[in-house]
Interface confidence: low
């Protein structure tokens, strides 16, 4: 006769491992007992369990409550056992030794491989600011056995680099995602994808990119210079910019204080009925935690009694 077993049994951490051992004998042969032992290299054999044809299942105290026979119906020639709730320390070599009548003893070895699924973690890099060069956006680390695969899923253009650290029973893989920050990346998902044979499906952790920026400022409202004449109501200047974090706005007049009656409402400067007093250079100052920008315009309030053309000068500075 001969023993049938597997070279390798693979199980996920926490699952039950079936250690197969079946004696295929000639007619009339009987199995007296099946002894299971842990036989890692450099260490003596440690008995795990013994299945006796008459006295039943015996389990080592070290494995109490963790070794069982497969559920019935059972073939008397089947010496397989179940190792419940596999842990990483169970990984190693096991030997099945079958004592038969009248053929004698047979033995076979198998390797138990316990897959340890990774628990990935994603760590954002330093704050991203437009204008930076290649910058770490995030790093993703996953440790498992065997070593997991760590990749990135994103629409954002960038570069990746990976490194691996081997431990006694596992390996940690870290992948970094670098990019050149731009405002178009704001709100874009950056997803770390971890693959591993112990996972039913890939694990995904998403980080939302936040890139600080401040756009150039400009002022709207002076497009039709003929509207800026004495007596006009509802005249206003609007400061245009955008940023992350959202910017705040401040209005000043370069050639003196803001005239009385002029209302500042965030990005908008509202004028009372226009007089020549409202002529001057107005500055919009836009700022956020990242940067600041200025844009200045010259307002020249026309007197309809005069034919002189209105002068408008637009200047942007940052």
């Amino acid at each position: 006769g001969e023993l049938e077993t597997s070279d390798v049994v693979t199980v996920v951490l926490g699952q039950d491992a079936k250690l197969p051992c079946f004696y295929r004998g000639d007619s009339g042969e009987q199995v007296g007992q099946v002894a299971w032992a842990r036989v890692d290299a450099g260490e003596g054999a440690q008995e795990l369990a013994l299945l006796h044809s008459k006295y039943g299942l015996h389990v080592s105290p070290a494995y109490e409550g963790r070794v069982e026979q497969p559920p019935p119906p059972r073939n008397p020639l089947d010496g397989s056992v179940l190792l419940r709730n596999a842990v990483q320390a169970d990984e190693g070599e096991y030997e099945c030794r079958v004592s038969t009548f009248p053929a004698g003893s047979f033995q076979a070895r198998l390797r138990l491989r316990v897959l340890v699924p990774p628990l990935p973690s994603l760590n954002p890099g330093p704050a991203l600011e437009e204008g930076q060069g290649l910058t770490l956006a995030a790093s993703c680390t996953a440790e498992g056995s065997p070593a997991p695969s760590v990749t990135w899923d994103t629409e954002v253009k960038g570069t990746t680099s990976s490194r691996s650290f081997k431990h006694s029973r596992s390996a940690a893989v870290t992948s970094e995602f670098h990019l050149v920050p731009s405002r178009s990346m704001n709100g874009q998902p950056l997803t770390c994808v971890v693959s591993h044979p112990g996972l039913l499906q890939d694990q995904r952790i998403t980080h939302i990119l936040h890139v600080s920026f401040l756009a150039e400022a400009s002022v709207r409202g002076l497009e039709d210079q003929n509207l800026w004449h004495i007596g006009r109501e509802g005249a206003m200047l609007k400061c245009l910019s955008e940023g992350q974090p959202p910017p705040s706005y401040n209005w000043t007049r370069l050639d003196g204080p803001l005239p009385s009656g002029v209302r500042v409402d965030g990005d908008t400067l509202g004028f009372p009925p226009l007089t020549t007093e409202h002529s001057g250079i107005y500055v919009c100052h836009v700022s956020n935690e990242f940067s600041s920008r200025d844009s200045q315009v010259t307002v020249d309030v026309l007197d309809p009694q005069e034919d002189s053309g209105k002068q408008v000068d637009l200047v942007s500075a940052s």
């Epitope: 954002p124 939302i208 974090p245």
Partner: nanobody, 122 residues
Framework: QVQLVESGGGLVQPGGSLRLSCAAS????????MGWYRQAPGKQRELVAT???????NYADSVKGRFTISRDNAKNTVYLQMNSLKPEDTAVYYC????????????????WGQGTQVTVSS
């Protein structure tokens, strides 16, 4: 583990309004950013609006002036008031959130709700 439960989706005519709500539970720590993403059929999931615990706002250009995000920190709930709805706003709207961990560091995990369908059609 943070659980996010959305409500308020439905069918609405163009020009109409809807208000979405999302309640976060299961967290012993401070919820940081909360907000909304959406995904139309055959398209990538895209940002709609997000709000920080301090009240700073972020809107997608396509919804500025029409949608308003708000938040009740005490209830860990975020709302999205959607006005002047257009057919192109039709999508599954997902609530999203992240949180601070026990040491005050921001957790790297982004949590997602199951999504609520918004259909804009006459």
């Amino acid at each position: 583990q943070v659980q996010l439960v959305e409500s308020g989706g439905g069918l609405v005519q163009p020009g109409g309004s809807l208000r979405l709500s999302c309640a976060a539970s299961g967290s012993d720590f401070t919820i940081n950013v909360m907000g909304w993403y959406r995904q139309a059929p055959g398209k990538q999931r895209e940002l709609v609006a997000t709000v920080t615990s301090g009240g700073s706002l972020n809107y997608a250009d396509s919804v500025k002036g029409r949608f308003t995000i708000s938040r009740d920190n005490a209830k860990n709930t975020v709302y999205l008031q959607m006005n002047s709805l257009k057919p192109e706003d039709t999508a599954v709207y997902y609530c999203t959130a992240d949180q601070f961990g026990p040491l005050g560091h921001l957790s790297p995990i982004i949590y997602w709700g199951q999504g609520t369908q918004v259909t804009v059609s006459s």
